[in-house]
């Protein structure tokens, strides 16, 4: 699986999850998030050669098409597969609120 | 929606579904598929600016991050959203077989 366990331990050029730390205030301008200051959102990148963690029949077909037609601009793209939520603390006036934001952390990638 | 109805009618530079005809024999080397000869598989391409058909909170965050950090390599990617099946005819020896291959035709795209 193209997950953090594999990708963070290997120098993988092809599609894999990459570490990306996002600081809410500095990187997004989100001053309203009080906790955490930032988090590892991570991201997916890298080429998708034929059959590499193909998401659908279409991505398999497109991967083969791209292999046999290297000049073609059509190819699968490395995108998130499994995502996890992130719990944040913010304030509404003087009232603290805790919310779980879904699909915030990329744990693995796929070729789609 | 970034679907064929919209994308095929507009000159859209950003993430959209694009027409792609694949000939089974010539483009994939699949001699075993007898009908159809080929089909419009289509593909997704184009930049994913902030908030453009964002698939998850992560892609929204990543889009914003990319907007505020243009030098960053991390950005959402334009990938298939809705896919349709394709019915094919092939032969096993002298016995015809009809099979519906799932997720073969891209009908719309998203930024993931």
């Amino acid at each position: 699986a193209l997950d953090t366990n594999y990708c963070f331990r290997n120098l993988e050029e092809n599609c894999c999850v990459r570490p990306l730390y996002i600081d809410f205030r500095q990187d997004l301008g989100w001053k309203w998030v009080h906790e955490p200051k930032g988090y590892y959102a991570n991201f997916c990148s890298g080429p998708c050669p034929y059959l590499r963690s193909a998401d659908t029949t279409h991505s398999t077909v497109l991967g083969l098409y791209n292999t046999l037609n290297p000049e073609a601009s059509a190819s699968p793209c490395c995108v998130p597969q499994d995502l996890e939520p992130l719990t944040i603390l913010y304030y509404v006036g003087r009232t603290p609120k805790v919310e779980q934001l879904s699909n915030m952390v990329v744990k693995s990638c796929k070729c789609s | 929606a970034l679907d064929t109805n919209y994308c095929f009618r507009n000159l859209e530079e950003n993430c959209c579904v694009r027409p792609l005809y694949i000939d089974f024999r010539q483009d994939l080397g699949w001699k075993w598929v007898h009908e159809p000869k080929g089909y419009y598989a289509n593909f997704c391409s184009g930049p994913c600016p902030y908030l453009r058909s964002a698939d998850t909170t992560h892609s929204t965050v990543l889009g914003l991050y990319n907007t505020l950090n243009p030098e960053a390599s991390a950005s959402p990617c334009c990938v298939p959203q809705d896919l349709e099946p394709l019915t094919i005819l092939y032969y096993v020896g002298r016995t015809p077989k009809v099979e519906q291959l799932s997720n073969m035709v891209v009908k719309s795209c998203k930024c993931s």
Partner: antibody, heavy 119, light 111 residues
Amino acid sequence: EVQLLESGGGLVQPGGSLRLSCAASGFDFNSYGMSWVRQAPGKGLELVADIVSKTYNYTTYYSDSVKDRFTISRDDSKSTVYLQMNSLRAEDTAVYYCTVAPGGSFDYWGQGTLVTVSS
Amino acid sequence: DIQLTQSPSSLSASVGDRVTITCRASQSVSISRFNLMHWYQHKPGKAPKLLIYRASNLASGIPSRFSGSGSGTDFTLTISSLQPEDFATYYCQHSRESPWTFGGGTKVEIK
């Protein structure tokens, strides 16, 4: 260009044997099923024998009229298909065509070889 | 086995005529939307030639005056304007199941 060249036909006495050959070129012989189709004088086309590719275990078919007398075989290394005809009868007199069916239709045909069974 | 019955068994026509040949199968030769019926032209002393595959698809190099239609058990070969070189015997053939069989043929003669 696809070419199918039959040979081995001729005059043979009833009860005798003949071996027809069909040398193929211009296509991926190994991938496709090969057949022998005949036309007897004044009659229509009849599929006599058929052999599919190695992928499908060289499965063979014979029409009832030739079963247990004719044997179809192929040599993929030589791109050649054979029809061994034993215990020949007068009703086997016909032009025998070698043909290839990549799918459900017989797309390419040889020019045919005449087999005459007569005393 | 699936039997194919062609009609008529022979016909006389003139150059320029529209000719229709039918082929009826003893059971359906269609599977899903695919119609597994094919048509051939055969002239004396020559190899048979594929005209139409899967009911309505024109084989490579075949003039557009030839067309095919039908589904299920009933199929038609049409020559829109008969040419001198079209006088021959025409056969249908199915590939719905093994064994594949041919129809009895339709001989098209000059009137």
